[in-house]
């Protein structure tokens, strides 16, 4: 059987000879060299060599336990002649003994940590960790103790855990933000002769809201022209806050003053400035100076710092309204006038009024914008703003005239205003009614008396207030002895009726009927229209079959016997 125990070897051997490990020996070995000892496994033939005759093992190189603490090898004892093993192949261990040859090494060369300013003493900041590659199971070579080399009295470190805590009350970021702390880790439980390593911890105090906003001045003055439209920025005010980030965010508001309704303040999120803007239209002539009380406050407040006072500040803002030479202002935004279409030239329609709103009350002259009245139908009295016609009107041509009137300051022609004028032309009965279309109809030869052969419609260009009322009749010259009659339907239509039984197209092929159409307005207007009636052969259903191609026309425009 094999005769050995576990082999132990001290690491980092510095002798000049190979380091002796131990002896492999089989009780079958007679000492005559008949056995051959063979080593295999971790480092065999390289780190570890064996005397194949004696079984003595030596280490050829300096070994480092931290690199490899245990080597597992296999031993064979073989009969040199036959190759026959005299023992079963066996595994054995070479264990490397530790020496304190490694200093503690921090997991980071530099740690960065943050802790809120004004933290209570003992507030956790960060935990640093150092590891020692030496054997933790043997001696104190890997027992690490932490201490602080730099960073007192602000911070402390727990010797066992490496936890860094705050050690000073009321550390103020606004006073000092950055701290560099140096921590030492020492092995051998911190005893003399222990190896040590250090790390740097860069600690930043993070901001808390422990400072209110402050205006650098108590009063601000801005000027703005009275013409500034709503939304116009007038000026910027800025309160400073020693804090940073959201703790330094400021909201501005107007809390008091006679300009409370006239101005707004908005917060510029980028610059943290308050922008004073116009809220309503200003009028120098009404009020020349406004005062506002503007407040700057932190939107996020930490209750534990309220004892330091309110987290807001206020300032007075004085706004001076500057006079602006303003254009004339019309009494209305638009004017609507009306005039009869039969008005004579120079008839006055109405008038416009404009005034200079400035204190100077400069006189104004009026004119028509000729781009809006190319035909020069209207004119204006430049002095008093009276509008009058300069040409005759026709409602039936144009119902509405849309023109623009200009008011200009006489002393400063650059200051002018414009106003729209809508002129409605009122109707006058100046058009006669007419047939709605050209009427040409036919009558069957075998037609019976009082038979309706055509319905007549009329149109009138006028637009009477109470609507059209037309009357129809045969012209006086055709009324007696006519072959047809006109029946007025009293609904603005009329019918042509036969007056006899039967017509002979060979005797009279065409009749021309003069019809008088009158309206019922003042003054009455009438016109005469002619209806052509052809005599045709029809079937028994009354459908036309044939007519003469042309009518015999009487020189007076009436057929004989119509």
């Amino acid at each position: 059987s094999w005769m050995w125990n576990q082999f132990f070897l001290l690491e980092e051997y510095t002798g000049s000879d190979y380091q002796y490990v131990g002896k492999l020996h089989s009780d079958q070995d007679r000492g005559d060299g008949s056995l051959k000892y063979i080593l295999s496994g971790d480092g065999a033939g390289d780190l570890f060599i064996i005397n194949e005759n004696t079984g003595d093992i030596q280490a050829t190189k300096r070994l480092d336990r931290e690199e490899k603490p245990v080597y597992i090898l296999r031993a064979q004892a073989i009969n040199r002649r036959t190759g026959r093993p005299v023992e079963p192949e066996s595994e054995f261990i070479i264990k490397i003994h530790d020496i304190n040859d490694n200093e503690p090494i921090f997991t980071k060369e530099v740690y960065t940590a943050t802790v809120p300013e004004m933290s209570d003493v003992g507030t956790f900041v960060v935990q640093v960790t150092a590891t020692d590659a030496d054997d933790p199971t043997y001696g104190n070579s890997a027992k690490v103790v932490y201490s602080i080399l730099q960073g007192q009295p602000y911070f402390s470190v727990e010797s066992e855990t490496g936890i860094i805590k705050t050690a000073l009350l009321n550390m103020d970021r606004e006073n000092r933000e950055q701290y560099q702390v140096v921590i030492q880790a020492k092995d051998m439980g911190g005893q003399m002769g222990g190896l040590s390593g250090t790390t740097t911890v860069n600690i930043t105090l993070t901001d808390v809201n422990d400072n209110p906003p402050r205006f650098p001045q108590s009063t601000y003055q801005f000027k703005t022209p009275e013409s500034s439209p709503p939304g116009t920025p007038i000026g910027r005010i800025k309160a400073s806050d020693a804090d940073v980030g959201e703790n330094a965010e400021i909201e501005y508001s107007i809390t008091d003053g006679e300009g409370l309704d006239m101005f707004d303040v908005i917060t510029d999120q980028e610059t943290q400035e308050g922008i004073i803007t116009v809220k309503k239209l200003l009028d120098f002539e009404k009020k020349k100076v406004y005062t506002l009380k503007v407040e700057a406050s932190n939107p996020y407040v930490e209750p534990r710092f309220l004892y330091l006072g309110p987290f807001k500040d206020s300032a007075t803002v004085r706004i001076v309204v500057e006079d602006v030479d303003e254009p004339p202002v019309f009494s209305k935004l638009a004017y609507i006038l009306q005039i009869r279409e039969d008005a004579q030239i120079n008839t006055t329609i109405g008038s416009v009024t404009a005034q200079d709103p400035d204190a100077a009350r400069n006189p104004v002259k009026y004119s028509v914008d000729r781009h809006t009245d190319m035909d020069r139908i209207f004119n204006i009295d430049s002095g008093n703003g009276s509008i009058f016609t300069s040409k005759l009107l026709d409602r039936e041509t144009l119902l509405w005239h849309n023109i623009t009137v200009i008011a200009t300051e006489i002393n400063n022609p650059k200051q002018s205003s414009r106003v729209p004028l809508y002129i409605k032309v009122l109707d006058v009965n100046d058009n006669a009614p007419e047939f709605a279309e050209f009427y040409e109809t036919f009558v069957c030869e075998k037609a019976k008396a009082d038979q309706l052969i055509q319905t007549l419609h009329a149109v009138d260009k006028d637009d009477p207030y109470s609507g059209h009322q037309f009357s129809f009749s045969l012209a006086p010259e055709a009324a007696s002895g006519s072959n047809f009659t006109i029946q007025d339907n009293k609904d603005n239509t009329a019918g042509i009726l036969t007056r006899k039984n039967g017509y002979n197209r060979h005797e009279m092929s065409t009749y021309l009927l003069p019809v008088v159409i009158s309206d019922n307005d003042y003054p009455v207007q009438s016109s005469t229209g002619t209806v052509t009636v052809r005599v045709c052969a029809c079937d028994h259903h009354g459908n036309m079959q044939s007519c003469h191609a042309e009518a015999l026309i009487h020189p007076t425009g009436l057929s004989t016997g119509a």
């Epitope: 005559d32 060299g33 051959k36 073989i78 009969n79 040199r80 002649r81 036959t82 190759g83 026959r84 093993p85 023992e87 079963p88 192949e89």
Partner: antibody, heavy 117, light 111 residues
Framework: EVQLVQSGAEVKKPGSSVKVSCKAS????????MHWVRQAPGQGLEWMGD????????HYTQKFKDRVTITVDKSTSTAYMELSSLRSEDTAVYYC??????????WGQGTTVTVSS | DIVMTQSPDSLAVSLGERATINCRAS??????????MHWYQQKPGQPPKLLIY???NLESGVPDRFSGSGSETDFTLTISSLQAEDVAVYYC?????????FGGGTKVEIK
């Protein structure tokens, strides 16, 4: 390089003896056993015996125990195999071979011994 | 004596094909996980050459198409892809017990 050089061919009469030499070079002669193997014409290999050069310890196969003698001369790193009472069936090629853990890792070129009347 | 029986006596294999030679010992030649069985190649007019030792270990300088396996009494020599230069007689040998004995040999030829 390891070399085993054997003596030349021999023609012998039946009943006589033959001594074949094997000169070793390229390694420590006393660290390895030396074996002798023969091969009759057209036949297989037959192990005859071996010797430990450091102690002159020998092993012979039963078949040749009374007729074979294996010796060494450590000074010349030479091994010898002497076979006596030769018979026609001893006609063969005789090889020396270095032994290492039961295997023959180097062989001589062989010596032909012919036994004929 | 331990008798070594090789099979087959001869073997014809195409170039590039696998050749397998078996060797059976009359009793076990294994002890403590070591198999005292070795394989040799002999070409005409030349001494034998060691190919495989201790059943499966390839001798230095031998192509890796040769491999050995087995334990106790049954062992195999395999040529994974036969080459022209592999034409030879192959012998197995045991060193487990005196006298050391060889198999009768297997002649490998090209088909």
């Amino acid at each position: 390089e390891v070399q085993l050089v054997q003596s030349g061919a021999e023609v012998k009469k039946p009943g006589s003896s033959v001594k074949v030499s094997c000169k070793a070079s390229g390694y420590t002669f006393t660290n390895y056993w030396m074996h002798w193997v023969r091969q009759a014409p057209g036949q297989g290999l037959e192990w005859m015996g071996d010797i430990d050069p450091s102690h002159s310890e020998t092993h012979y196969t039963q078949k040749f125990k009374d007729r074979v003698t294996i010796t060494v001369d450590k000074s010349t790193s030479t091994a010898y195999m002497e076979l006596s009472s030769l018979r026609s069936e001893d006609t063969a090629v005789y090889y020396c071979a270095r032994g290492d853990l039961g295997r023959f890792d180097y062989w001589g070129q062989g010596t032909t011994v012919t036994v004929s009347s | 004596d331990i008798v070594m029986t090789q099979s087959p006596d001869s073997l014809a294999v195409s170039l590039g094909e696998r050749a397998t030679i078996n060797c059976r010992a009359s009793e076990s030649v294994s002890i403590h996980g070591t198999h005292l069985m070795h394989w040799y190649q002999q070409k005409p007019g030349q001494p034998p050459k060691l190919l495989i030792y201790a059943a499966s270990n390839l001798e230095s300088g031998v192509p890796d198409r040769f491999s050995g396996s087995g334990s106790e009494t049954d062992f195999t020599l395999t040529i994974s892809s036969l080459q022209a230069e592999d034409v030879a007689v192959y012998y197995c040998q045991q060193s487990f017990e005196d006298p050391w004995t060889f198999g009768g040999g297997t002649k490998v030829e090209i088909k």
